[in-house]
Interface confidence: medium
Amino acid sequence: GIAIPRNSGCPNSEDKNFPRTVMVNLNIHNRNTSTNPKRSSDYYNRSTSPWNLHRNEDPERYPSVIWEAKCRHLGCVKADGNVDYHMNSVPIQQEILVLRREPRHCPNSFRLEKILVSVGCTCVTPIVHHVA
Amino acid sequence: GIAIPRNSGCPNSEDKNFPRTVMVNLNIHNRNTSTNPKRSSDYYNRSTSPWNLHRNEDPERYPSVIWEAKCRHLGCVKADGNVDYHMNSVPIQQEILVLRREPRHCPNSFRLEKILVSVGCTCVTPIVHHVA
């Protein structure tokens, strides 16, 4: 583990798994509210690579509800509203940290977990594989 | 807090702030690898709304370095490579959980924090405001 002189005022951990198991304050501080109160947008409808949002729920996880983007089309929407299949709608994926109850159903013991979510879609030029 | 009957075998928390302060195993489990290997992509270059990645650093946070997407253009890139200013490149934002040391410099006590990051960009039809 890390050899750090313990500051007075630091919580002490007697857990044999320290420093893998630590105390975490779940009174989640949100750094965004003051700077960006209006986060939700209608980009999912206005994008040339529009997407639908699907609800993924798991009561053993925090956050328990995660919304996943699914691109509506394989291609991208043109100005006339038709789909251009020479372009591709692709999901922009991102890993997020979540907390999973471990052991299951225990209210105050968690494991950090990384999960991959699709946040939205973007329109890209396809990669063309030329056959010799 | 969550009203869950305590299982035998669950760690006990004597913390007066329970369940705000919990034990978290930091041995991060990755749900992606087996089912969905990382597909970190070159979409940032191939998108009609391409973006650059900018470094944001904070040593008291995990992860300490976060690379944020910044759209390259106000408009969107057309097939001929020119920018179409009748369309808009906009950032897709997502909240992620990060860990912050609290009290500062304490090695085994953390607070979860939500921050808003720009993950990538998408091309949208602009909202036109007609002046009477």
């Epitope: 890390i2 940290l97 | 990382k38 070159d42 008291e60 040391r101 993950v119």
Partner: antibody, heavy 126, light 107 residues
Framework: EVQLVQSGAEVKKPGESLKISCKAS????????TSWVRQAPGQGLEWMGG????????DYAQKFQGRVTITADESTTTAYMELSGLTSDDTAVYYC???????????????????WGQGTTVTVSS | EIVLTQSPDFQSVTPKEKVTITCRAS??????LHWYQQKPDQSPKLLIK???HSISGVPSRFSGSGSGTDFTLTINGLEAEDAGTYYC?????????FGPGTKVDIK
Amino acid sequence: EVQLVQSGAEVKKPGESLKISCKASGGSFSGYGTSWVRQAPGQGLEWMGGITHFFGAVDYAQKFQGRVTITADESTTTAYMELSGLTSDDTAVYYCARDPNEFWNGYYATHDFDYWGQGTTVTVSS
Amino acid sequence: EIVLTQSPDFQSVTPKEKVTITCRASQNIGAELHWYQQKPDQSPKLLIKYASHSISGVPSRFSGSGSGTDFTLTINGLEAEDAGTYYCHQTDRLPYSFGPGTKVDIK
């Protein structure tokens, strides 16, 4: 400018232990990790293990499990690698490297070794 | 464990020539592949991260491409100072591994 300065060359006998230090300066220490990589004479690079300073979480390559211990001291911004039960096969240059632990292009804790120490030459001989 | 293979093992090149080094992973590693240059008696130096991202301070003649299992490092217009050994490095799964290296010599 980030700099990693390692302790000096060592000559050891088989069965002895080795402890190398890696002092970091010029950047945040707690926000990063330190990995250890070795290179036997005329050979390629071999990852031994690494530590995430923020948590003190350590990962070791299976090959070195039980023989290697990686620690760090935030107060002196120094990482350490201890290797026990030395044999002549452990004769190598040992490098420490900074592991940024970044959130990159949508992924947590991605790793590339962006700064390296100058290397510590270790000779194990009876 | 992910095994990286590099080709060629050795390349002797004339200055201003284009050099291509390939790295193949035994499993899909996405874009978690980095390239390092090591000159004799020096520490490795990061050239390219995440398959294709350039590093500030590294000359623009160095570029990388690929994803999944096949990756390429390209030196467009080799210079005398580019002599050394080039390693690919995967950080997708533990244990992290390096390729065996490609030695580039100047003719």
